[in-house]
């Protein structure tokens, strides 16, 4: 069998909401993956599991099942959304993310994704992880790959 290539493209969009009383930030982060099947037979994308970390703490997880199949020598682009919550011991971030005087409230998140594919009863897992900048202060739609190398304005400690 030839390889199945998984390429994490980046953040597609991030939608923000807040709970004022709980000083909590809710970020719905949609990511884009390219999965390429280099084989001469179809493969099934059985599931995608993803998690997002902020400051070494897992702030969101998602799992998609029975996603799609990819034909021979074909590629599919898949979007998946991870709902994340920045709260509790990280509630200090609420102050930073809600500063109306700052235009871009970039925070660094680590995106981890594992894709499980199957073909002829054989299962294969491919994992990727990438640091991305996400604006926690407003709803943002990114050009693909745009969120990777932005300058990040760090909150005061």
């Amino acid at each position: 069998p030839r390889s199945i290539d998984v390429k994490y493209i980046g953040v597609k969009s991030a939608y923000v909401s807040y709970d004022v009383q709980k000083r909590t930030i809710y970020l719905n982060i949609t990511n884009t993956l390219n999965i390429t099947n280099n084989n001469y037979y179809s493969v099934e994308v059985e599931n995608i599991t993803a998690q997002v970390q902020f400051a070494k703490t897992v702030i969101g997880k998602a799992r998609l099942n029975n996603i799609t199949h990819i034909g021979p020598l074909d590629m599919k682009q898949i979007d998946y959304t991870v709902p994340t919550v920045i709260a509790e011991e990280m509630s200090y971030m609420y102050d930073f993310c809600t500063l109306i005087s700052i235009k871009v409230h970039n925070i660094v998140l680590m995106m981890q994704v594992t894709v499980t594919t199957t073909y002829f009863g054989h299962s294969e897992q491919i994992s990727q992880e990438r640091y991305q900048y996400v604006d926690c202060g407003r709803n943002t739609t990114y050009q693909l790959g745009q969120s990777e190398y932005l300058n990040v304005l760090q909150p005061q400690q």
């Epitope: 807040y18 004022v20 009383q21 500063l99 109306i100 005087s101 235009k103 304005l153």
Partner: antibody
Framework: QVQLQQSGAELVKPGASVKISCKGS????????MNWVKQRPGKGLEWIGQ????????NYNGKFKGKATLTADKSSTTAYIHLSSLTSEDSAVYFC????????????WGQGTSVTVSS | DVVMTQTPLSLPVSLGDQASISCRSS???????????LHWYVQKPGQSPKLLIY???NRFSGVPDRFSGSGSGTDFTLKISRVEAEDLGVYFC?????????FGGGTKLESK
């Protein structure tokens, strides 16, 4: 330390226009909104609008749309206000003021530029 | 536009006295993020305004602790516990919760 240095006083004729400058130093000029505030003699303060030098984004007080145009030059770290079709009502002191990130208030002000409109 | 009403217009005080300035807004100044953007500035003759108190009650750096701010919603107060000569000037409240940003008409703190 943060400094905002404004250009000198102006005496202009009615119907003319004027451009006032505000040079910022001692901070990351491109990353802070710059505001402009009008104060007529013996009167209160009026917010004209603001500009984000990083990308030129602006927000105006509707009252000053068409009267004031805000611009900024990142390379010289200078913000400008252009006032057009001047009348006696535009005679005032104009202040630039930086919008601070963490206090979320106008925490540093220029010394003010006096504009007198007279024939 | 949000109207900011300051009282009194003029406040004659003796040095060492307490001074209290009121500021009332025509609508709530609580932002959707839960913060209240009500600031106080002081302006001395021939000078630019200076930030005194931000977000209702936070003293700006270098501001003496005889200055305090309080209030919520639409009603706010600036207090000076013991007025000193250097405190004399015009005090303005300001809101930036709503665009356009607006200022109170000012209160002149003067010596009796």
């Amino acid at each position: 330390q943060v400094q905002l240095q404004q250009s000198g006083a102006e005496l202009v004729k009615p119907g003319a226009s004027v451009k006032i400058s505000c040079k910022g130093s001692g901070y990351a000029f491109s990353s802070y909104w710059m505001n402009w505030v009008k104060q007529r003699p013996g009167k209160g303060l009026e917010w004209i609008g603001q500009i984000y030098p990083g990308d030129g984004d602006t927000n105006y007080n509707g009252k000053f749309k068409g009267k004031a145009t805000l611009t900024a030059d990142k390379s010289s770290t200078t913000a400008y206000i252009h006032l057009s079709s001047l009348t006696s009502e535009d005679s005032a002191v104009y202040f630039c003021a930086r919008w601070g990130h963490y206090d979320e208030a106008m925490d540093d002000w220029g010394q003010g530029t006096s504009v007198t409109v007279s024939s | 536009d949000v109207v900011m009403t300051q009282t009194p217009l003029s406040l004659p005080v003796s040095l060492g006295d307490q001074a209290s300035i009121s500021c009332r807004s025509s609508q709530s100044l609580v932002h959707s993020n839960g913060k209240t953007y009500l600031h106080w500035y002081v302006q001395k003759p021939g000078q630019s305004p200076k930030l005194l108190i931000y977000k209702i009650s936070n003293r700006f750096s270098g501001v003496p602790d005889r200055f305090s701010g309080s209030g919520s919603g639409t009603d706010f107060t600036l207090k000076i516990s013991r007025v000193e000569a250097e405190d004399l000037g015009v005090y303005f409240c300001s809101q930036i919760t709503h665009v356009p940003w607006t200022f109170g008409g000012g209160t002149k703190l003067e010596s009796k």
